[in-house]
Every structure is written in C-alpha cells, then in structure tokens.
C-alpha cells in the first residue's frame, strides 16, 4: 500500500475532548469475499443500458479504492442491438459510508464521510416535456 | 434515535491491546443533502426493470437504515408496458461499509463490517444454456 | 435545450488563483460526467480535469495535478475548476464540456484565462 | 499515455469534392469488452466552440450531415467528407478518452 507520512498535528487517541468519537476495529468482518465490481457479475456488459467501471483512489480515504460506473450510451440497446435514443441509460446512484483521515495524514484518525457513488445503470422512459 | 443499554462489558477506549483500532469522527461531513433513495429520483418507478425499496433497521448497525431494493418483475418492462420474459430484470448490488457496535450494545466501540446491498435493478440479456 | 456557460476568466498574476464556473442547463446535470478543456492561443485542444457525474471521482493530467481542483454543485448545476499557483503557461481559453459518455457532445463558449505579470 | 497522431495537419480542400484526414493512436482504442472503439471527431469552426461529429468511431452525432464519416479500428481512423462544402472549414480534432482524455494536433482544413 502507500506509506503516508504521518502528521505531526494527529489528535491524541485518549484525548476526550476529540468530538464525538469511537473506537472502531479495521479488522474487516466481510460477508462478500469479492472485491472487485467486475468480477461479481457481468451485468454491466449484459445491460441494455450497459456501464464501465472507473477506478479512483484516494490514499485519504479508506476504502481508498472506489469504483464507480459510467453508462456507455445516452439511449438504452435494443433487441436488434442498436441504440435506442427513445429510451435513457442513467446511472442508479448509491450514498455510500467512507472513513476521511482528519486531519490529513493521520493513520489512527478519521472522520465518517458519506459520499455518492453511481453503482450501475438502467434503461428508464424518458420524460417528456409538452410546450404548450 | 434508539437508547441502546451499555453493556458492562464493553472494552475501555484506551486499551492498547484492542485490535487495531482508529479514532473515528461520528459527524459525518455529508457531500449529498438526499438521504431518501425514493426522493433521489423515480427511476425506480420509470425504469425497464422496476423496483421498489424495502426499509431495512437494524440498532446494532451504523447507519441503522439502508434500504433494498427488489425487482419487480423478473423479466423486463417492453414498450407496450408488458413484461417481457425474453429479457430479465436482475438486482446491481453493491459493497458498502457499515459499522457494527462490537461488542453489542456498546455505544461507542464499532467493527467495520462489508454487507452487500442491491442498489437498483437494470434488464439484461439472458444467458442462454444450449443444451448438446 | 442544453446550454453550458462559462464564467470566472481573466487577467491574473503568475502564482495566483482563480475560480471559473460553469452553469449548466437544459438537461438533468447529475446524470453527466463534466470536463474541463483548455486551448492555449492559436494552439490545439488540451483536456484538465474530469468529475462524476456524482463528484466523488476526479481525474487530472500530470499538467495540472495538485494546482487545479475540478469540482460541482449537483444542487445548484454548476461545474467548477479552481486554479492554484497559476503559470504563464496557463494561459488558454477554458471550455467546459458535458460527457455525453465516452465523447463530449455540448461545449460552452469558453471563458478567457490570461497569466501574466 | 496514448499519444493521438493526426495527418495532414493541413489540408487545402475544393467544394464539391471529398476530403479525408487520418487519426492513429499509439495503442488500441478497442475494447473488446464493450466491442467499441472509444474515439470521436470534432470539428472547431473559426471562432467558435468544437462540437462533436463522430463517436465511437463511426457513429454521426444528431445534426450532423450525412457527408460526414468515420471509419476505423484498433489503432487507425478516419474522418471523411464526401463533398466538402464551404461552411466544413475548420480545424478537425480526434479524441480518446477513457478514464484521461487525449486530443489529435487538429488538421486544418481551408478551401483552396
């Protein structure tokens, strides 16, 4: 992994002044052994509002790896394979927990951060707006 | 939100010896205002594949909510507004973190934990088994 | 329809910073992935940063990574670019653009950013 | 990085006959995964913004005229014009973009 140099400003573990604080263990207990979005189904490519995926890392957040997907197409294919522009491919999106190191650098201390991640993508009826 | 009792048994912040552990901020800097999936948008109403969203509590679970979604249908939404059983409507799942209050009760001690959630649904193409 | 429109240009100091922005209308903005590109005076089309769609993932060319920060306001349909301890070399006129998917299908008109002391 | 490489970077062309500038990229811009070819065409007009003209190789973008081409594979693409009118006059971009995005120099196309 990549070695962070550590900040000489991390607050103290014992200090309980820290806001509103807990003590977390990192030891995983995962019920999924499959890390990697690509490999857990092939849905993506079956779609018919198919995605990629996108990797991006961030050594300041943990997970530090997210994945996060990308529709392929504005429309959605069809039965003969085509894109069809009378439907939309949108990304389904999902608020996800993720640990900040706060201050930056710290390898004991974080902070909860929600972020918003799109997960995959579906084929929905556009809406169509009438002038009147 | 819930009172949970503390269990008496519940291990001291400052025990060196409790398996690597990290201080965590519960404040959670929140990117995204939406915290209903069903606000977010209707895709999952005017998607090919529809779902809806089950509600799913837990105490022990940080956060206590996160919702599920279930397809509708097995196969898919055609143009007609009919299912389509050529097509199927499969579940995009996705990791997420959660903390659970470890040992149970205690209010301020967590083990990271990795569920599997179903996100949305999307239609694929079947995968077709010919038989020799 | 969709329309892009840049703002935040100017004349500005070798080592100083700006912010431009990009309002954004006539298409639902949280489903897009935005990017920003750069065409120096009477040179070719350079790319600068990317965002998600949700603004979780960015992506920067070495040129101006750890200067430049990409970043939006889902709520308010506006796609930033903030420029840190800016160059002579910066000196280009900023294009936003909308990722259609793989390929960017709407550009605004661009917002002049000009180093020099 | 993958390196785009247009030709000609100039090209004197006459109204009514065809026009076609080459695009090679320093590794493949096929994926086999999704069986598509991540490049596309832009034309910038003078004094104007670029606006697209061909993704994925070969698909035209809405509004543009039939005139307009793409074709190509892996490594090597091609923009043709059938019959370049007055208005084609521009500088003509190719474009990869993945996870990065990278741009051809442009081929300036002028009437004679």
């Known amino acids: 992994g990549i070695t962070i140099p550590r900040n000489p400003g991390c607050p103290n573990s014992e200090d309980k002044n820290f806001p509103r604080t807990v003590m977390v263990n990192l030891n995983i207990h995962n019920r999924n052994t499959n890390t990697n979005p690509k490999r857990s189904s092939d849905y993506y490519n079956r779609s018919t509002s198919p995605w990629n995926l996108h990797r991006n890392e961030d050594p300041e957040r943990y997970p530090s790896v997210i994945w996060e997907a990308k529709c392929r197409h504005l429309g959605c294919i069809n039965a003969d394979g085509n894109v069809d522009y009378h439907m939309n491919s949108v990304p389904i999106q999902q608020e996800i927990l993720v640990l900040r190191r706060e201050p930056p650098h710290c390898p004991n201390s974080f902070r909860l951060e929600k972020i918003l991640v799109s997960v995959g993508c579906t084929c929905v009826t556009p809406i169509v707006h009438h002038v009147a | 939100g819930i009172t949970i009792p503390r269990n008496p048994g519940c291990p001291n912040s400052e025990d060196k010896n409790f398996p690597r552990t990290v201080m965590v901020n519960l404040n959670i800097h929140n990117r995204n205002t939406n915290t209903n999936p069903k606000r977010s948008s209707d895709y999952y109403n005017r998607s090919t594949s529809p779902w809806n969203l089950h509600r799913n509590e837990d105490p022990e679970r940080y956060p206590s909510v996160i919702w599920e979604a279930k397809c509708r249908h097995l196969g898919c939404i055609n143009a007609d507004g009919n299912v389509d059983y050529h097509m199927n409507s499969v579940p995009i799942q996705q990791e997420i973190l959660v903390l659970r209050r470890e040992p149970p009760h205690c209010p301020n001690s967590f083990r990271l934990e990795k569920i599997l959630v179903s996100v949305g649904c999307t239609c694929v193409t079947p995968i077709v088994h010919h038989v020799a | 329809q969709v329309q892009l429109v840049e703002s935040g240009g100017g004349v500005v100091q070798p080592g100083r910073s700006l912010r431009l922005s990009c309002a954004a209308s006539g298409f639902t903005f949280n489903n897009y992935w935005m990017t920003w590109v750069r065409q120096a005076p009477g040179k070719g089309l350079e790319w600068v940063a990317s965002?998600?769609?949700?603004?979780?993932?960015?992506y920067y060319p070495a040129s101006v990574k750890g200067r430049f920060t990409i970043s939006r306001d889902n709520s308010k349909n506006t796609l930033y670019l903030q420029m840190n301890s800016l160059r002579a070399e910066d000196t280009a006129v900023y294009y936003c653009a909308r990722e259609g998917a793989y390929y960017l299908d709407y550009w605004g008109q661009g917002t002049l950013v000009t180093v020099s002391s | 990085d993958i390196v785009m490489t247009q030709s000609p970077l100039s090209l004197p062309v006459t109204p009514g006959e065809p026009a076609s500038i080459s695009c090679k990229s320093s590794q493949s811009l096929f994926w086999s995964e999704s069986h598509m070819n991540y490049l596309a065409w832009y034309l910038q007009k003078p004094g104007q913004s670029p606006q697209l003209l061909i993704y994925y190789a070969s698909t035209r973008q809405s509004g543009v005229p039939d005139r307009f081409s793409g074709s190509g594979s892996g490594t090597d693409f091609t923009l043709k014009i059938s019959r370049v009118e007055a208005e084609d006059v521009g500088v003509y971009y190719c474009?990869?973009?993945?996870?990065?995005?990278?741009f051809g120099q442009g081929t300036k196309v002028e009437i004679k």
């Open positions: 965002v998600s769609n949700t603004g979780s993932s960015t």
């Open positions: 474009h990869h973009h993945y996870d990065s995005h990278t």
